[in-house]
Amino acid sequence: SLGSLTIAEPAMIAECKTRTEVFEISRRLIDRTNANFLVWPPCVEVQRCSGCCNNRNVQCRPTQVQLRPVQVRKIEIVRKKPIFKKATVTLEDHLACKCETVAAARPVT
């Protein structure tokens, strides 16, 4: 009620910046034709832009990105035994972010 003491602190905006996120390495990234394998590791960390902006008309967007190839292990199971292979997955890291104006939606033609 009005005038009652409050212990809660003011909410701080989650600013638009790069943050560490978890990216799942789906098997489709490695091989779309075969499902009989495992991938190690199943997920990795990437840097991605997130957060909100002071204005509803703008969005947190990456202004600089970097592609980073990483090696994963593809474990094919043949007759219950593993065959180890290496595969390269290209990750996208966001290096810089900016609150950018949301482009007006294009009319569907």
Partner: antibody, heavy 121, light 107 residues
Framework: EVQLVQSGAEVKKPGSSVKVSCKAS????????MYWVKQAPGQGLELIGR????????DYVEKFKNKATLTADKSTSTAYMELSSLRSEDTAVYFC??????????????WGQGTTVTVSS | ETVLTQSPATLSLSPGERATLSCRAS??????MHWYQQKPGQQPRLLIY???NLESGVPARFSGSGSGTDFTLTISSLEPEDFAVYFC?????????FGGGTKVEIK
């Protein structure tokens, strides 16, 4: 219970050959690779190679390609390692080790008791 | 090949103390690192697989951690039966390799 039982100690002359056996029980022999590992006196462990008992296909570490020959007999669930042209540096304890499956991981989860091979003139 | 360097070579401790064993790889091995215990005249025994997973039947005082190139095996409180040699082994790069071992001895 998975068990790997190896043949007994051997004393051999330089230049001769030796064949070590490893009898497996407690699991389906053809469903796991078998590895062989060398441990020289007072030393660490060194991988020699592996065999797929299902079809006899082998992979060797480069330095053992002309030294070790791995075979397997499905009918007796026994893996073998033959060492040729023996020299004093082949004196060691040799282990067979099963290739275990642990989710994404494949450690050596069961080991034979070891076979001591001594090369001496 | 991937060289695994274990340190220290020898660790002198008393029962009840904490043991921290290190294994450093010459190149990244992800988390495909395993730890084995070997007592004199015996075969190695699997303790930890995949850097941090405790093998079935192994006491909870054993734990593993690390990824990339630096790995640690910790024994929280040494029991008399824990005095032995410990080896790390990587299975990311061919050929699979072992470390030189750390001997944990009674002080």
């Amino acid at each position: 219970e998975v068990q790997l039982v190896q043949s007994g100690a051997e004393v051999k002359k330089p230049g001769s050959s030796v064949k070590v056996s490893c009898k497996a029980s407690g699991y389906t022999f053809t469903e796991s690779y078998m590895y062989w590992v060398k441990q020289a006196p007072g030393q660490g462990l060194e991988l020699i190679g592996r065999i797929d008992p299902e079809d006899g296909s082998t992979d060797y570490v480069e330095k053992f390609k002309n030294k070790a020959t791995l075979t397997a007999d499905k009918s007796t669930s026994t893996a073998y390692m033959e060492l040729s042209s023996l020299r004093s540096e082949d004196t060691a304890v040799y282990f067979c080790a099963r290739f275990g499956a642990r989710s994404y991981f494949y450690p050596m989860d069961a080991w034979g008791q070891g076979t001591t091979v001594t090369v001496s003139s | 090949e991937t060289v695994l360097t274990q340190s220290p070579a020898t660790l002198s401790l008393s029962p009840g103390e904490r043991a921290t064993l290190s294994c450093r790889a010459s190149e990244s091995v992800s988390t495909l690192m395993h730890w084995y215990q070997q007592k004199p005249g015996q075969q190695p025994r699997l303790l930890i697989y995949g850097a941090s997973n405790l093998e079935s039947g192994v006491p909870a005082r054993f734990s593993g951690s690390g990824s990339g190139t630096d790995f640690t095996l910790t024994i929280s409180s040494l029991e008399p039966e824990d005095f032995a040699v410990y080896f790390c082994q990587q299975s990311w790069n061919d050929p699979w390799t072992f470390g030189g071992g750390t001997k944990v001895e009674i002080k």
